[in-house]
């Protein structure tokens, strides 16, 4: 049994997340994950899910009753999702920590927008013509 | 020229994001994007970047001076990043809108944690033995 299972069960007790009513009104993450089979689509969704859990864990990091469980689960996420690659985890953390209300951050984000957009579609690297085929869109003549 | 370029230039004016000092203290997104060549790694990072821009645009959605620019850029992101797939965009939006401080959301998230974790590593779908080869880790005997 993977180590996170025991620790997740401990968190379930702490949050009363084993109660039958928890399943009411559908799932948060599981149904969404079932919709996406392509690895790159799954990464788009899992990226948001992992950042949610990291925020959740941050809010409870000083609670001694679940500290060990939280740390074990975070370590397991780092091994599995980030492949133990600290640079990947660090870059991810930087992105999740930017404040959208900070005017300097806003200005930088807008300053970088054109270049970010240019790289958004999967084949952005391999030329405009190829890229337009990737997302199957062509611009109408102006 | 892609349509977002003109609109991004308009946003730059609005945010004074063309000023030379904007480049001080490095980039928010561009250096991070340069670190990652693998498509799945890029999607992990771009997922956070896109959610940042969507939050930013939401904060300025009622400002008439940039409304058209914001809507054009959002449409372009939907075409390029979500491949014009509304279900993908909708699932993404759901994930970004969950409140980490809502106790019902917390309980659901913890309830689903074991299954989310089981799918985190790329080969999760194809059995434990194969997965352990993906991150090349085996569990020590307890």
């Amino acid at each position: 049994q993977d180590p996170y299972v025991k620790e997740a069960e401990n968190l379930k007790k702490y949050f009363n997340a084993g109660d039958p009513d928890v399943a009411d009104n559908g799932t948060l993450f599981l149904d969404i994950l079932r919709n996406w089979k392509e690895e790159s689509d799954r990464k788009i969704m899992q990226s948001q899910i992992v950042s949610f859990y990291f925020k959740l864990f941050k809010n409870f990091k000083d609670d001694q009753r679940i500290q060990k469980s939280v740390e074990t689960i975070k370590e397991d996420i780092n091994v599995k999702f980030f492949n133990s690659n600290k640079k990947k985890r660090d870059d991810f953390e930087k992105l999740t920590n930017y404040s959208v209300t900070d005017s300097n951050v806003q200005r930088k984000a807008v300053h970088e927008l054109i270049q970010v957009m240019a790289e958004l579609s999967p084949a952005a690297k391999i030329g405009k013509r190829k890229r337009s085929q990737m997302f199957r869109g062509r611009r109408a003549s102006q | 020229q892609d349509p977002y370029v003109k609109e991004a230039e308009n946003l730059k004016k609005y945010f004074n994001a063309g000023d030379p000092d904007v480049a001080d203290n490095g980039t928010l997104f561009l250096d991070i994007l340069r670190n990652w060549k693998e498509e799945s790694d890029r999607k992990i990072m771009q997922s956070q970047i896109v959610s940042f821009y969507f939050k930013l645009f939401k904060n300025f959605k009622d400002d008439q001076r940039i409304q058209k620019s914001v809507e054009t850029i959002k449409e372009d992101i939907n075409v390029k990043f979500f491949n014009s797939n509304k279900k993908k965009r909708d699932d993404f939006e759901k994930l970004t809108n969950y409140s980490v401080t809502d106790s019902n959301v917390q309980r659901k998230a913890v309830h689903e944690l074991i299954q989310v974790m089981a799918e985190l590593s790329p080969a999760a779908k194809i059995g434990k033995r194969k997965r352990s080869q993906m991150f090349r880790g085996r569990r020590a005997s307890q």
């Epitope: 939280v70 074990t72 370590e75 690659n85 600290k86 990947k88 | 340069r34 670190n35 090349r136 569990r139």
Partner: antibody
Framework: EVQLVESGGGLVKPGDSLTVSCVAS????????IHWVRQAPGKGLEWVAT????????FYSDSLRGRFTVSRDNANNSVYLHMSSLRGEDTALYYC?????????????????WGRGTLVTVSS | NFMLTQPHSVSESPGKTITISCTRG????????VQWYQQRPGGVPKIVVF?????PSGVPDRISGSIDTSTNSASLTISGLQTEDEADYYC??????????FGGGTKLTVL
């Protein structure tokens, strides 16, 4: 003060088995990955194996997989490297090295703290 | 393979500056942190640069690390060379499974 102390090295014959140990102090042991790195006489550094902290996942050099097994006992701040079917080319100084705390985004550097090593000699 | 290639040896006079390169054979240099270790004769390896460019406390600012994505390599630069800098220097990074990998080492001689 962070300390890692290896023991258990010695002279063994080809084909024999040997377990080297490492005892750590000065930090919360279970939080950190631990690496084994070896250095043959007059040669460079070679990574052997890694074991994660709380989750105890094991990672091995492809060239050694199957012959070497890493394990840890967090209660006793100890990590072990069991080596079987030893060969002459396994003769080396074996270092125990502290890795990252992968639950802490502000973790100290990987491979920051090294033990002094324990010498394993494989010879008939 | 994922080998990190370093020059076998470099030598320079005291006071001068040397740069030791570490070229990644496969995979992208910027996707994994690079560390540098100094090992004096008979001593234990000691980290002098971690996470590409960071220096641990106690390491002089004469020593610096950098990454060059155009050559897919990392570099260790030591300025104002001193006799005590004479040692073997190893770069270290990770393969695509995030296994630790080391360069072959560079022997630095201060003439």
């Amino acid at each position: 003060e962070v300390q890692l102390v290896e023991s258990g090295g010695g002279l063994v014959k080809p084909g024999d088995s040997l377990t080297v140990s490492c005892v750590a102090s000065g930090f919360t042991f279970s939080n950190y990955f631990i690496h084994w790195v070896r250095q043959a006489p007059g040669k460079g550094l070679e990574w052997v194996a890694t074991i994660s902290g709380r989750t105890k996942y094991m990672f091995y050099s492809d060239s050694l997989r199957g012959r070497f097994t890493v394990s840890r006992d967090n209660a006793n701040n100890s990590v072990y490297l069991h080596m079987s079917s030893l060969r002459g080319e396994d003769t080396a100084l074996y270092y125990c090295v502290r890795g990252y705390d992968h639950s802490d985004s502000n973790s100290a550097a990987d491979l920051l703290h090294w033990g002094r090593g324990t010498l394993v000699t494989v010879s008939s | 393979n994922f080998m990190l290639t370093q020059p076998h040896s470099v030598s320079e006079s005291p006071g001068k500056t040397i740069t030791i390169s570490c070229t990644r054979g496969r995979g992208y240099i910027a996707s994994y942190y690079v560390q540098w270790y100094q090992q004096r004769p008979g001593g234990v390896p000691k980290i002098v640069v971690f996470e590409d460019t960071q220096r641990p406390s106690g390491v002089p600012d004469r020593i610096s690390g950098s990454i060059d994505t155009s050559t897919n390599s990392a570099s260790l630069t030591i300025s104002g060379l001193q006799t005590e800098d004479e040692a073997d220097y190893y770069c270290q990074s990770y393969d695509d499974a995030n296994h630790v990998i080391f360069g072959g080492g560079t022997k630095l001689t201060v003439l």
